[in-house]
Amino acid sequence: FKVATPYSLYVCPEGQNVTLTCRLLGPVDKGHDVTFYKTWYRSSRGEVQTCSERRPIRNLTFQDLHLHHGGHQAANTSHDLAQRHGLESASDHHGNFSITMRNLTLLDSGLYCCLVVEIRHHHSEHRVHGAMELQVQTGKDAPSNCVVYPSSSQDSENITAA
């Protein structure tokens, strides 16, 4: 399977909420011995590979923001910790996977990565990720609402296998 990022750039005003989205593409095995671990983190555009480094989002690590579920299930974070930081990650039946960030500040600007790990038989892992940029703006040049910019077809499928 692959991960697509429908939007490569989100430009938002301070104080707004935003939902960053990734989507699983291709065949997703829904067998009883297959589960999915999904999470989000901040990163930098590395020289070798984007999304290599895992930095916290609002002081929460990728471990704090994870979802873990079977191939046919939906899930969302009910962690008080995440919600106290204005964050919630969610996953639906259709392969959509998102993180919502509330009350954006300039400090939220940066590169965000979604990570999906398909786990088979509890030990075999296939890892994919997607990347997108969030720009939070203030002042007269800031948009009144979030503006999203679609990924080019080439950019929208970031594939990294483990």
Epitope: D33, T35, Y37, V48, S52, F62, Q63, H66, H68, H79, L115, V117, I119, H121, H122, H123, S124, E125, R127, A161, A162
Partner: antibody
Framework: QVQLVQSGAEVKKPGASVKISCKAS????????MNWVRQAPGQGLEWIGL????????SYAQKFQGRATLTVDKSTSTAYMELSSLRSEDTAVYYC???????????WGQGTLVTVSS | EIVLTQSPATMSASPGERVTMSCSAS?????MYWYQQKPGQAPRLLIY???NLASGVPARFSGSGSGTDYTLTISSMEPEDFAVYYC?????????FGQGTKLEIK
């Protein structure tokens, strides 16, 4: 803060079994796999196996298949490793360690020394 | 099973010296992980996904490599860096460690 606290040292006779516990706190127990690694005196690290508290799924290194049994008690966030048919070569420090999927073992227990001697 | 071979098995260095150690895999792996272990202590994660520093690890440590050849470098040795270093792979089951490189004070 994240903690993995293991049970105390054990002395066993050859042929016996030992069961070690690893109590987790400070994190979501079901979001990680619990791995077991051992280290014989003066030797390197050897991976025994893992268990997913999320669904109880296990994987073992071939060497320990059939002799090691990994279990969890989600109600107490505790992982267990039982090793049967002990022999002198099983004398080692046994560690539990948590691992997030697609990551590494970032927190380890303090280790449990198991001595097998007649 | 993927066999990880670390070299050298033992090496000596002085504080302030640059140190490099290697980990060679018997077949290609996607990522390498490095741990540090001091006597009487549990291992500590140093490097994840080949080249990224784990939380709290000083910037003098760095990792690199791909395929079958990986390297851990300490740019300027500090007294607390004398320890045993292990590489490990999660790419293929069963998950294996190298035999370790012992870093001693010269």
């Amino acid at each position: 803060q994240v903690q993995l606290v293991q049970s105390g040292a054990e002395v066993k006779k050859p042929g016996a079994s030992v069961k070690i516990s690893c109590k987790a706190s400070g994190f979501s127990f079901t979001g990680y796999t619990m791995n077991w690694v051992r280290q014989a005196p003066g030797q390197g690290l050897e991976w025994i196996g893992l268990i997913s508290p999320y669904n109880g799924g296990t994987s073992y290194a071939q060497k320990f298949q059939g002799r090691a049994t990994l279990t969890v008690d989600k109600s107490t966030s505790t992982a267990y490793m039982e090793l049967s048919s002990l022999r002198s070569e099983d004398t080692a420090v046994y560690y539990c360690a948590r691992r997030a999927y697609g990551y590494a073992m970032d927190y380890w227990g303090q280790g449990t020394l198991v001595t097998v001697s007649s | 099973e993927i066999v990880l071979t670390q070299s050298p098995a033992t090496m000596s260095a002085s504080p302030g010296e640059r140190v490099t150690m290697s980990c060679s895999a018997s077949s290609s792996v996607s990522y390498m992980y490095w741990y540090q272990q001091k006597p009487g202590q549990a291992p500590r994660l140093l490097i994840y996904d080949t080249s990224n520093l784990a939380s709290g690890v000083p910037a003098r440590f760095s990792g690199s490599g791909s395929g079958t050849d990986y390297t851990l470098t300490i740019s300027s040795m500090e007294p607390e860096d004398f320890a045993v270093y292990y590489c490990q792979q999660w790419s293929s089951y069963p998950f294996t460690f190298g035999q370790g490189t012992k870093l001693e004070i010269k």
